[in-house]
């Protein structure tokens, strides 16, 4: 049967200090997020089916203005990558908040069963947990 | 048969004062916009088939520079949401123009037959009607 | 059989002076880029199957800060369009870097066999060749 594995997640919380990862949650009880195939393992998205996926993300910084993002010497950056297994670790998508408070992007990428995707937000600014401002999803598009 | 409902719309006009909605149009006679399944009701997109959709939008402000977006105390904001039926009203996707003149994003979301999507642009700046700068679309991806 | 034509490309190089086009490359030997259906002709993407496609792009400027993009009188702009055949030449998607260093967007558009897509970057700033910062892809979604 067609895979059609698909997930759309909302932000649960940020990690403890020294852990730049965003922790996600999904499920109809939480609103409009869902997991249909992929798994969430300790807040990180794990792929269940090999294939080419469309990965998309939007992250909005909370309590943010153009000046708050431009003030910092090192811009706040969001990177989406495969963080495990270690042998497949790679950055898939990276964006910086330059005088902006939201980043949004998408890309096609091959993913394999067991790949765990991490979304690392580096910088001192915190992301908004509003479900229409910060979300992360994948969609299986072909084998 | 597979749904494959899909639409890509171009901006027709903005609403009268006090109406923040953008009004869309679509069809091959207009260029590269089209409606294959969904309907346009008074310039708003109405869904005809239940399922999970990829919703995407790009809006570019006309006569815009970084200073024109940053000058305003309240940033210009674009929100895409279900505006009717009222019982299902919710904001799906929200972005602000912080010192930028274009926003673009996308997300996966469950939509139901009869859901009407509205795109609300709040602020005093006007959107460009150029078809390569401002567009809005949905794509059915799975039941 | 289902088309499922799909491609994800990484930046190879920019064009010579007076040629604003970005030149792309793809294939598993290069990393996570691939061509499954479409072709690359002198670094430009050529469509082989008629249909509606989701076109997406992200371009990040190298050696960039908010000041470097805002300093220029004419903002750096990225346009994706059909550049050949000449009879079908049109701009599909256009974005400017206003005090930002990355643009990312996507849209649905009908494409026909033989359409060659060009990505024109105008301005003096150069794009990053990092594969997680600059990429361009298409996905056939329906006839």
């Amino acid at each position: 049967s067609l895979g059609w594995d698909i997930a759309e997640l909302q932000l649960n919380h940020t990690g403890p200090q020294q852990d730049p990862r965003l922790y996600w949650q999904g499920g109809p009880a939480l609103g409009r997020s869902f997991l249909r195939g992929p798994e969430l393992d300790k807040g990180q998205l794990r792929i269940r089916r090999d294939g080419i996926y469309m990965v998309h993300i939007q992250v909005t910084l909370a309590i943010c203005s153009s000046t708050s993002t431009s003030r910092h010497h090192h811009p706040t950056t969001l990177a989406v990558g495969i963080c495990s297994p270690a042998s497949r670790s790679i950055s898939l998508l990276r964006l910086s908040f330059h005088q902006g408070c939201t980043i949004a992007s998408q890309r096609l990428t091959p993913l394999a069963r067991g790949d765990t995707l991490c979304t690392n937000l580096t910088g001192t600014l915190l992301p908004s947990r509003n479900t229409d401002e910060t979300f992360f999803g994948v969609q299986w598009v072909r084998p | 048969s597979l749904g494959w409902d899909i639409a890509e719309l171009q901006l027709n006009h903005t609403g009268p004062q006090q109406d923040p909605r953008l009004y869309w149009q679509g069809g091959p006679a207009l260029g590269r916009s089209f409606l294959r399944g969904p309907e346009l009701d008074k310039g708003q997109l109405r869904i005809r088939r239940d399922g999970i959709y990829m919703v995407h939008i790009q809006v570019t402000l006309a006569i815009c520079s970084s200073t024109s977006t940053s000058r305003h105390h309240h940033p210009t904001t674009l929100a895409v949401g279900i505006c009717s039926p009222a019982s299902r009203s919710i904001s799906l996707l929200r972005l602000s123009f912080h010192q930028g003149c274009t926003i673009a994003s996308q997300r996966l979301t469950p939509l139901a037959r009869g859901d009407t999507l509205c795109t609300n642009l709040t602020g005093t700046l006007l959107p460009s009607r150029n078809t390569d700068e401002t567009f809005f679309g949905v794509q059915w991806v799975r039941p | 059989s289902l088309g499922w034509d799909i491609a994800e490309l990484q930046l190879n190089h920019t064009g010579p002076q007076q040629d604003p086009r970005l030149y792309w490359q793809g294939g598993p030997a290069l990393g996570r880029s691939f061509l499954r259906g479409p072709e690359l002709d002198k670094g430009q993407l050529r469509i082989r199957r008629d249909g509606i496609y989701m076109v997406h792009i992200q371009v990040t400027l190298a050696i960039c800060s908010s000041t470097s993009t805002s300093r220029h009188h004419h903002p750096t702009t990225l346009a994706v369009g059909i550049c050949s055949p000449a009879s079908r030449s049109i701009s599909l998607l256009r974005l400017s870097f206003h005090q930002g260093c990355t643009i990312a967007s996507q849209r649905l558009t009908p494409l026909a066999r033989g359409d060659t897509l060009c990505t024109n970057l105008t301005g003096t700033l150069l794009p990053s060749r990092n594969t997680d910062e600059t990429f361009f892809g298409v996905q056939w979604v329906r006839p």
């Epitope: 049967s1 949650q25 999904g26 499920g27 869902f34 997991l35 249909r36 195939g37 992929p38 798994e39 969430l40 393992d41 794990r46 269940r48 090999d50 069963r113 067991g114 | - | -």
Partner: antibody
Framework: ELQVVESGGGLVQPGGSLRLSCAAS????????MHWVRQAPRKGLEWVST????????YYADSVKGRFTISRDHAKNTLILQMNSLKSEDTAVYYC????????WGQGTQVTVSS | QTVVTQEPSLSVSPGGTVTLTCGLS?????????PGWFQQTPGQAPRTLIY???SRHSGVPSRFSGSISGNKAALTITGAQPEDEADYYC???????????FGGGTHLTVLG
């Protein structure tokens, strides 16, 4: 601490029914694919059933198809195996397992089908 | 019906190396069968050693490794310990179907 604990086993007559439960603690059950595997006395492991994260996909071994139903009780963070029309050959220890890679096993619950 | 085959029993000396295999009665095992290996000691529930051919589960000693060798999945124990005496089961996923098949198990004896 992360745990899966099976319950609901017992002695039942052929043709009878049992409802096994697997209670999850330390994680949200609906975030994972879940499985039931059984082991008859002095025999090997036999896969019984699997359910996907959103419950839209359920899979069964031929030996239990049409008799067993896998489901979740989201409110109780519990996995269910409803077993009907039980046969003597269904006698086994039933294990609940978390994750597509079978990463966490419960201790099992004994089901005995006998007259 | 396809059957998953394993050696019924094997033995190894302490500190020695042993390889257990997992095949299909018809066809070859590939990485897309996502071979898994499970260890069961008497009176205990099974525990996962290896998943997706070669990924070691957390807490599993590095002496356990998984691979595809020829047309079979293989579990190699390098430097066997007395506590490795147990039953070992392999499981394969039917390609594209999300249904699973376990082998009959291999009883490993650590001599001495």
């Amino acid at each position: 601490e992360l745990q899966v604990v099976e319950s609901g086993g017992g002695l039942v007559q052929p043709g009878g029914s049992l409802r096994l439960s697997c209670a999850a603690s330390g994680f949200t059950l609906s975030n994972y694919w879940m499985h039931w595997v059984r082991q008859a006395p002095r025999k090997g492991l036999e896969w019984v059933s699997t359910i996907s994260t959103d419950n839209s996909r359920t899979y069964y071994a031929d030996s239990v198809k049409g008799r067993f139903t896998i489901s979740r009780d989201h409110a109780k963070n519990t996995l269910i195996l409803q077993m009907n029309s039980l046969k003597s050959e269904d006698t086994a220890v039933y294990y609940c397992i978390r994750g597509s890679d079978y990463e966490h096993w419960g201790q099992g619950t004994q089901v005995t089908v006998s007259s | 019906q396809t059957v998953v085959t394993q050696e019924p029993s094997l033995s190894v000396s302490p500190g020695g190396t042993v390889t257990l295999t997992c095949g299909l009665s018809s066809g070859s095992v590939t990485t897309t069968n996502y071979p898994g290996w499970f260890q069961q000691t008497p009176g205990q529930a099974p525990r996962t050693l290896i998943y997706s051919t070669s990924s070691r589960h957390s807490g599993v000693p590095s002496r356990f490794s998984g691979s595809i060798s020829g047309n079979k999945a293989a579990l190699t124990i390098t430097g066997a310990q007395p506590e490795d005496e147990a039953d070992y089961y392999c499981a394969l996923e039917e390609i594209g179907s999300y249904t699973y098949m376990f082998g009959g198990g291999t009883h490993l004896t650590v001599l001495g």
